[in-house]
């Protein structure tokens, strides 16, 4: 079969998921596509415990996650329900701020330097985290 019992090389296993942490930056859509080509998705945070795990690995650096409101309501890229799910926004966020001068508001969510979330312009080149569920990961992925 195509199911895996361990994570690919250079991915980190945690609670039946595999995570890969970039050390360079891309716009949100490009980061999203990068993960998809790895049969993964931008990280979806479903608990405080997962939040702390990701936060530990990324450090105090702006980092994209798989949450956006580009089509209206906030949505997780894997379909996890946003309204009833875990949230960790900074105070006063998300604010869809238009004052940045880059056109439009802020439609993509990222971890800030303290781990709490902020919405920002999706074109900003932030680091990103890919996640794939262990039982879904395909065989012998390439070295990343």
């Amino acid at each position: 079969g195509s199911e895996r019992t361990c994570c690919p090389v250079n991915w980190v296993e945690h609670e039946r998921s595999c995570y890969w942490f970039s050390r360079s930056g891309k716009a949100w859509a490009d980061a999203d596509n990068y993960c998809r080509l790895e049969d993964a998705h931008l990280v979806v945070v479903t608990s405080w415990e997962e939040q702390k795990f990701v936060q530990h690995h990324i450090g105090p650096v702006n980092t994209w996650m798989g949450l956006h409101d580009q089509n209206g309501p906030w949505k997780w890229v894997d379909g996890t329900d946003y309204e009833t799910g875990f949230k960790n926004w900074r105070p006063e966020q998300p604010d869809d701020w238009y004052g940045h001068g880059l056109g439009g508001g802020e439609d993509c969510a990222h971890f800030t330097d303290d781990g709490r979330w902020n919405d920002d312009v999706c074109q900003r080149p932030y680091r990103w985290v890919c996640e794939t569920e262990l039982d879904k990961a395909s065989q012998e992925p390439p070295l990343l």
Epitope: S2, S22, R23, S24, G25, K26, A27, D30, A31, N33, Y34, R36, L37, E38, D39, P125, S138, Q139, E140, P141, P142, L143, L144
Partner: antibody, heavy 121, light 108 residues
Amino acid sequence: EVQLLESGGGLVQPGGSLRLSCAASGFTFSSYAMNWVRQAPGMGLEWVSVISRSGGYTYYADSVKGRFTISRDNSKNTLYLQMNSLRAEDTAVYYCASRLAVAGSEAFDIWGQGTLVTVSS
Amino acid sequence: DIQMTQSPSSLSASVGDRVTITCRASQNISSYLNWYQQKQGKAPKLLIYAASSLQNGVPSRFSGRGSGTDFTLTISSLQPEDFATYYCQQSYRTPLFTFGPGTKVDFK
């Protein structure tokens, strides 16, 4: 030996169809996202399409979107490109290429020898 | 889309020469830049990825530099087998990886 071998090219009339194949050997095909890249005669390189490792995600250049379909059969270590509604400007050598991903950077590290597609009446 | 330009479009050089090719991106692509070599009638070959990382098996006379919008490929001492066309490629916009128009290196 790591190898990609394209086949299926040839002469086709405008509006016609063609299916290209790319057979992989010497590496774990299912571990890599795969691309098609083309090169018109005497011209530069143009990325055409990519497919994820499992085949669940596909992307296309605007110039071929809606006309070309990329697919793969990991059990056969083979990549495909179904080309419909072909136009004269699709005339090119078509290469398959594997996606190297290192620390967030991506490149095409293994290339086939190419197969020539000529669209002409 | 991100546009890539290269200069010069062609150059003539002799064996032993130091050759430098420039690539420019229409926007900041950080270090997401690859270089390929293509000989007549053959498939391209990856030389350098991530702006400066040498691909396995590529001679050390090839080197890449740059970040942001401006990049260079240098061949420190041109060898007979290096006469070819060289392409840069951005990999910032996953997966819309656009190539430069190429630089042809031929005999002086």
